[in-house]
């Protein structure tokens, strides 16, 4: 039995090691807004490539009447995108509330922004300095303080401000050791609400340009949630760009922009007043529910799902980006009608990478009574006391990863006594440019609790249209001889997604 279990595990490892490398997003600190344009994404592996190939084939052989919708009608049989043609734009300091039916793609939207889910089509623009709060709260073995600071340099004022905003002061004050009380592994056990508030505090404490809050108020009572939303999301983080996944009308009213998703598509994008004007029946239906915000999250989601489903069936079609823009937006024409394949598929693109590496996450996460995934540390600019970007101590451009990959492959061969040692797992990969972003220290006042390491505002467009042929000669590497490289971050992502 042990032998079969081992074989199963080895097969999973081998399967994982032969997967395409997960790429970290490039970032650029000049970008101040967050933009998503015409983004379509699939969770199913390989659909991105399939999407591209099928589209290319479709372009090569159009039907006699010139109808180019053939591919799309056939494609629906192959797989459904988790996000379809999503558009939004939020400026620095704005709050975008994302609501929608169950399984509409709200979390997937955040995954796309983080680079966990690569779009098969579309364009994303943001600085890349992200802090993420998962809907599944989690605690690492260590003190409360360590769980909140989580490797970021300690700033007492910011730390205590965050604790206060997340209403942890009272909880901590009950312990004799205060915030030095040890959690997990021999320490105390926290309630669900305490865990949720610590997870939120961890995300808020980290200095970032964009905060992704995925239903962060789990296990909190209505009053506490309302207070923390006010004190933390609205006040403490007032000058930060925030994307909040929520189902509360109160949050939608307070948000600068609202994105309502239904079955992967954008049902509505705009302000709350525009929602009332453009979708009066929909908004009145939800607001007509007595004490809608007092319901449990499950019930709110259920009502929202049922309402969206009914309005979709009744022909109250989702308000598209272009329709909404015509009716109510006075925005610059940044989003053209032409679909750009700007976050390019790795098969036929040149991707840029930052050589600033992410710190591997510890593996000893505490998961009390849940199968919650580990939150990945997305500190793309590692924090130091001086607030400068830290360069890795090894040469990233060296063959280090190659050697690591070969070593992993040889270990696998040894473990499996593989007869496929000559098997070609090498992949033709495009070249990549690597660049360093150094964030100068901004000398700001204490009014902004994040100002210690607030980076210079800067614009990276993750993804421009690049002619591969033009650049091939300039950036040619003989990648044939380099095996597939699997990083620790990819491994973490893999085990999180495939956790049984």
């Amino acid at each position: 039995q042990t032998w079969y279990d081992s074989l199963g595990a080895i097969n999973k490892i081998q399967d994982f090691l032969q997967k395409q490398e997960y790429k970290t997003l490039e970032y650029n600190l000049t970008t101040t807004e967050v933009v998503m344009e015409n983004v379509t994404a699939f969770w199913e592996e390989g659909f991105g490539e399939l999407f591209e190939k099928a589209k290319q084939n479709n372009n090569n052989r159009k039907t006699s009447n010139g109808d180019d919708s053939l591919f799309f009608s056939n494609f629906s049989l192959l797989g459904t995108p988790v996000l379809k043609d999503i558009n939004f734009k939020i400026e620095r300091g704005q709050l975008l509330a994302v609501a929608g039916s169950t399984g509409a793609g709200k979390t997937s939207l955040l995954m796309v922004i983080m680079g966990e889910l690569e779009p098969s089509e579309g364009k994303i623009k943001h600085s890349g300095r992200i802090s993420f709060c998962s809907q599944f709260s989690w605690i690492m073995p260590g003190t409360i303080k360590e769980n909140i600071i989580f490797g970021v340099s300690y700033d007492e004022y910011r730390y205590r401000s965050v604790i206060k905003a997340c209403q942890l002061e009272e909880d901590i004050s009950k312990f004799a050791e205060k915030d030095n009380i040890v959690l997990g592994e021999g320490g105390i056990t926290l309630s669900g609400g305490q865990r949720a508030r610590i997870s939120l505090a961890r995300a808020v404490y980290k200095d970032a340009d964009l905060y992704l809050l995925d239903s962060p108020f789990g296990y909190l009572d209505v009053l506490t949630e309302k207070e923390i939303f006010e004190s933390c999301v609205c006040k403490l983080m007032a000058n930060k760009t925030r994307i909040l996944v929520t189902s509360k009308m109160e949050h939608l009213k307070k948000a600068d922009k609202i994105l309502i998703l239904h079955e992967g598509s954008s049902y509505f994008y705009g302000t709350f007043s525009e929602l009332q004007n453009l979708q009066p029946d929909f908004s009145s239906k939800l607001m007509g529910c007595d004490s809608f915000d007092q319901f449990s999250a499950e019930r709110r989601n259920s009502i929202l799902t049922e309402t969206l489903h009914r309005f979709s069936l009744e022909g109250d079609a989702p308000v598209s980006w272009t329709e909404t823009k015509k009716q109510s937006f006075k925005q610059t024409g940044e989003f053209g009608e032409k679909r750009k394949n700007s976050i390019l598929n790795p098969i036929n693109s040149i991707r840029k990478f930052s050589i600033v590496q992410k710190t591997p996450l510890q593996m000893n996460g505490i998961e009390e009574d849940s199968d919650e995934p580990l939150e990945r540390r997305l500190s793309l600019v590692p924090d130091s006391e001086q607030g400068e970007a830290i360069l890795p101590r090894i040469s990233v451009i060296s063959t280090g990863p190659t050697l690591q990959a070969r070593r992993r492959q040889s270990v696998l061969n040894l473990m499996t006594h593989s007869v496929n040692q000559g098997q070609n797992i090498h992949r033709k990969t495009t070249a990549s440019t690597r660049k360093v972003s150094l964030a100068p220290q901004a000398n700001l006042t204490e009014l902004d609790i994040y100002s210690r390491r607030l980076s210079q505002e800067t614009g990276l467009e993750i993804s421009e249209e690049i002619n591969e042929e033009d650049l091939k000669e300039c950036f040619f590497d003989d990648m044939e001889s380099i095996p597939a490289v699997t990083t620790w971050n990819t491994y973490l992502r893999y085990i999180t997604v495939h956790k049984s």
């Epitope: 004022y157 401000s161 002061e169 004799a176 205060k178």
Partner: nanobody, 123 residues
Framework: QVQLQESGGGLVQAGGSLRLSCTAS????????MGWFRQAPGKEREFVAT????????DYADSVKGRFTISRDNAKNTVYLQMNSLKPEDTAVYYC????????????????WGQGTQVTVSS
């Protein structure tokens, strides 16, 4: 949870100096914001100075700025108030206080108080 004991008060001439100490019993001293308050006869208790948990942030009442200095030694569980250039109007009972709440000059926000030490400045 926390007991506070002040010391160092006494009679001093105007223009003179005194150093008040406040020792705390109990754990996690660095968690607490420590403050000094004073109460003159027939007057309200007023804020004098406060220092944050790791000493990185300090605040003073306008009337004592430049003359008084607050500091703390977390290893010794002690907070100090160095008073220079004392004036007769500084005469009062000086109280040490500890707050779990960051960051306040309001006496209402302080959870724990010492018994006080008398400071008298003669002209």
């Amino acid at each position: 949870q926390v007991q506070l004991q002040e010391s160092g008060g006494g009679l001093v001439q105007a223009g003179g100096s005194l150093r008040l100490s406040c020792t705390a019993s109990g754990r996690a001293f660095s968690w607490y914001v420590m403050g000094w308050f004073r109460q003159a006869p027939g007057k309200e208790r007023e804020f004098v100075a406060t220092v944050s948990g790791n000493g990185s942030r300090r605040d003073y009442a306008d009337s004592v700025k430049g003359r008084f200095t607050i500091s703390r030694d977390n290893a010794k569980n002690t907070v100090y108030l160095q008073m220079n250039s004392l004036k007769p109007e500084d005469t009062a009972v000086y109280y040490c206080a500890a707050s779990s709440t960051y960051y306040y000059t309001d006496p209402e926000k302080y959870d724990y108080w010492g018994q006080g030490t008398q400071v008298t400045v003669s002209s």
